[in-house]
Interface confidence: medium
Amino acid sequence: EEELQVIQPDKSVLVAAGETATLRCTATSLIPVGPIQWFRGAGPGRELIYNQKEGHFPRVTTVSDLTKRNNMDFSIRIGNITPADAGTYYCVKFRKGSPDDVEFKSGAGTELSVRAKPSAPVVSGPAARATPQHTVSFTCESHGFSPRDITLKWFKNGNELSDFQTNVDPVGESVSYSIHSTAKVVLTREDVHSQVICEVAHVTLQGDPLRGTANLSETIRVPPTLEVTQQPVRAENQVNVTCQVRKFYPQRLQLTWLENGNVSRTETASTVTENKDGTYNWMSWLLVNVSAHRDDVKLTCQVEHDGQPAVSKSHDLKVSAHPKEQGSNTAAENTGSNERNIY
């Protein structure tokens, strides 16, 4: 009678993570008597996956009933596959012995490859805000995918970026891989509403890439522009001066009025209005009693925005002249300004 052969018909099996892998194995003879065992890997360090004779293997089920006397099908199913299960599996026939069974013959092995989806890309930006025209770096990370081949793209508002560097680790063979990419983005004034998107495409995603996003509103700081103007006021001894604070982001802003260098009032921007680009506008009013001043008054609007060094704009108020003649850049009295803002 021909000697028993252990046949593993599949050289390789490809399984998606989370699914069940079927590893096929048949013997050509019932003789010699003895159990079958499955191992991952070969040599002394091999890992026991299933032992027909004894042990508890909760993830493994047999395809056929191994207790039947004439059974020669030793195929197994391994459930809930993860990338860590990747490797070469050997079906090994043992001959009954005393005190221990003796290895008799091994199959040629079946390589199990696991297709694992990448994790959702996580995009992170710089720790500190930056102003328009500056270049900032964003990183994108995704983990746990297999096989190694993967494509990563960067977009800003739908436009593909080209200035980025990507690494896939580890370089050698591994059960799963990670990708890390850093993109450089030049900020523009309208980026409060912008998004940076990292897109990852992998064979496991069936053409539906994963995306991670970062809002540039978390990254950008748009410094304010200031304009100080004098408004006509009906009362002879009072002059109304406004400080228009325009196009700033984020909203955190503190304004201080100085009269001849001395602090007159400090306030925090509250009822701001928003521009179409997401930046904010705010206006502060200062009512100056001209009769309280003998000499000319230097009024300064000083703004501290988002913890940055203060910027200021000054206006010289000449007390000797008639208040209504001061300053040419004035809005008319009928502009309907909100009286609640007048101090």
């Epitope: 004034r189 325009r246 009822t271 928003e274 521009n275 179409k276 506008n281 850049n329 300004s337 909100n338």
Partner: antibody, heavy 131, light 103 residues
Framework: AVTLDESGGGLQTPGGALSLVCKAS????????MGWVRQAPGKGLEFVAG??????????TYGAAVQGRATISRDDGQSTVRLQLNNLRAEDTGTYFC??????????????????????WGHGTEVIVSS | AVTQPASVSANPGETVKITCSGD???YGWYQQKSPGSAPVTVI????KRPSNIPSRFSGSKSGSTGTLTITGVQADDEAVYFC??????????FGAGTTLTVL
């Protein structure tokens, strides 16, 4: 339909003052930013002044060539916007157009953009500064 | 400053693109048939088209460059096209104008 009618142009003397008025109709005037744009003979468009809607408390903006000489104001009751230009120079000669911006305010959203969002123009009034 | 080409030309039915490079703000596009005549807005806020403007006019922006596209240009489109923008100091400015000649 939106109409913008400018008046007040004509022959002006150097060093003098000019007052142009734009009468608007066909839209809710108080809800939109307004501006003045001029065109010197044989030249391109030049921004002169803009005024934002009153309830936004945003005030005014001026082109570099008229900064310090111009005052723009609005009367929402009369639906008019006025441009006063002092200390007139020969280079102030040109056609002055009143312009309506698509930007304005709604709730807490206001816009301080004008040049990129003009959606209606007046026919213009010609100003000649000459002695 | 805002930069746009001095002139472009096209045959009727062709597609014309006029670019405007500025300080990365929003763009408006204004058509003027003759000097001193009232401009007509063809695009504002980068890509919004007034209801009275034909759909062959469209606007787009990539980075700091705005583009006016006229798809299937007609003889009546011959004009000077100005782009409007804001500089980095938020001062409203216009380009020098692009003369479109329909051959």
């Amino acid at each position: 339909a939106v109409t913008l009618d400018e008046s007040g142009g004509g022959l002006q003397t150097p060093g003098g003052a000019l007052s142009l008025v734009c009468k608007a109709s066909g839209f809710t005037f108080s809800s939109y930013n307004m501006g003045w744009v001029r065109q010197a003979p044989g030249k391109g468009l030049e921004f002169v002044a803009g005024i934002y809607i009153a309830s936004g408390d945003l005030g005014t903006t001026y082109g570099a060539a008229v900064q310090g000489r111009a005052t723009i104001s609005r009367d929402d009751g009369q639906s008019t916007v006025r441009l006063q230009l002092n200390n007139l120079r020969a280079e102030d000669t040109g056609t002055y157009f009143c312009a309506k911006s698509a930007g304005g305010c709604s709730a807490h959203s206001c816009d301080t953009y004008i040049a990129d969002s003009i959606d209606a123009w007046g026919h213009g009034t010609e100003v000649i500064v000459s002695s | 400053a805002v930069t746009q080409p001095a002139s472009v030309s096209a045959n009727p039915g062709e597609t014309v693109k006029i670019t405007c490079s500025g300080d990365s703000s929003y763009y408006g596009w204004y058509q003027q048939k003759s000097p001193g005549s009232a401009p007509v807005t063809v695009i504002y806020d980068d890509n919004k088209r007034p209801s009275n403007i034909p759909s062959r006019f469209s606007g787009s922006k990539s980075g700091s460059t705005g583009t006016l596209t006229i798809t299937g240009v007609q003889a009546d489109d011959e004009a000077v096209y100005f782009c409007g923008n804001e500089d980095n100091s938020y001062v409203a400015i216009f380009g020098a104008g692009t003369t479109l000649t329909v051959l």
